[in-house]
Interface confidence: low
């Protein structure tokens, strides 16, 4: 059946606003919020650049990668004690994400 | 309820091109992982590739520069660049869904009734 | 290349007996399997994701299991209805080497 609107598809999530702070030198964060509808196991996470319902164990084990968090094409690495995650694209440019 | 249905099955002669189309009701193409599969009468199913929301693509290694997927906003096409007799098939396109586990672990939650398409002199 | 073996080939089997369909991966797949239901003139339908999931709708008699490279589809006290050929995929996508997916050779089930 049709979803009603602003209803969200088991496992899925949307963007519902986006910004960006250039305040710091040097540096662009960017925040998304997302909303998401995730199945029993599943948290809301990071696939594809894409907030995206991923399993819960990737959370707890803070093994980043494994949610596919980089464009397609580039290299993901966890940094140092696993705070977040590294994307390295072709070209060798490295975008850094940390979880707070 | 969400569906897919493929068109573009015919006979062709071999060497002809043939591009094969998938539209999809219930669910925006655009945002899925989408995937060809084929089935020769009588046998089994064979992967053919998949396409990302980005438009990039893998294939199998069998498939490699014999199969073009690509996409528009409303399709997901199938172009056999060289038709032979082998590739006399039932084509069908599916929707890949996944969950994240050690990777993307990939399956295929809707699929058309396929399009027929015989390469034949 | 990813390999999947599924075995047996086909089989026959009464109603209400217990069927196991198994596939072997030639490398570890880490759960990247699903398993597929398919009749004459119709595509497949999804029965098991990820070894152990039942697709929404899927009847509670098929489960799947396994770990490894190493994986089996049950149908625990078959049907009439469950007379079909059955298929494994296999494969996992990672960001470094994109998506590799196999099928096994299926398995034709007959009920006698």
């Known amino acids: 059946q049709f979803l009603k609107e602003g209803q969200l598809a088991a496992g899925t999530c949307e963007v519902i606003a986006a910004h960006r702070d250039s305040s710091q030198p040097r540096r662009t964060i960017a925040r998304q919020t997302a909303r998401c509808a995730c199945r029993k196991g599943q948290i809301a996470g990071t696939t594809r650049a894409r907030p995206a319902c991923v399993d819960a164990r990737i959370i707890k084990t803070k093994q980043w990668c494994d949610m596919l968090p980089c464009l397609e094409g580039e290299g993901c690495d966890l940094l140092i004690n696993r705070s977040g995650w590294t994307c390295t694209q072709p070209g060798g440019r490295i975008k850094t994400t940390t979880v707070s | 309820q969400e569906q897919l249905v493929e068109s573009g099955g015919r006979l062709v002669t071999p060497g002809t091109p043939l591009t094969l189309s998938c539209t999809a009701s219930g669910f925006f193409l655009s945002g899925y992982y989408m995937s060809w599969v084929r089935q020769a009468p009588g046998k089994g199913l064979e992967w053919i590739g998949i396409i990302y929301p980005s438009g990039s693509t893998d294939y199998a290694s069998w498939a490699k520069g014999r199969f073009t997927i690509s996409k528009t906003s409303t399709t997901v096409d199938l172009k056999i660049t060289t038709p032979t007799t082998e590739d006399t098939a039932t084509y069908f396109c599916a929707r890949v869904a996944g969950y994240v586990g050690y990777g993307y672990e990939t399956f295929f939650d809707i699929w058309g009734p396929g399009t027929l398409v015989t390469v034949s002199l | 290349e990813l390999v999947m073996t599924q075995t047996p080939p086909s089989l026959s089997a009464s109603v209400g007996e217990t069927v196991r369909i198994r596939c072997l991966a030639s490398e570890d797949i880490y759960s990247g399997i699903s398993w597929y239901q398919q009749k004459p003139g119709k595509p497949p339908t999804l029965l098991i994701y990820g070894a152990s999931n039942l697709e929404s709708g899927v009847p509670p008699r098929f489960s799947g299991s396994g770990s490894g490279s190493d994986y089996t589809l049950t149908i625990g006290g078959v049907q009439a209805e469950d007379a079909a050929t059955y298929y494994c995929?296999?494969?996992?996508?990672?960001?470094?080497?994109?998506?590799?997916?196999?099928f096994g050779a299926g398995t034709n089930v007959e009920i006698k």
């Open positions: 995929l296999g494969g996992v996508t990672y960001s470094s080497t994109g998506t590799h997916l196999t």
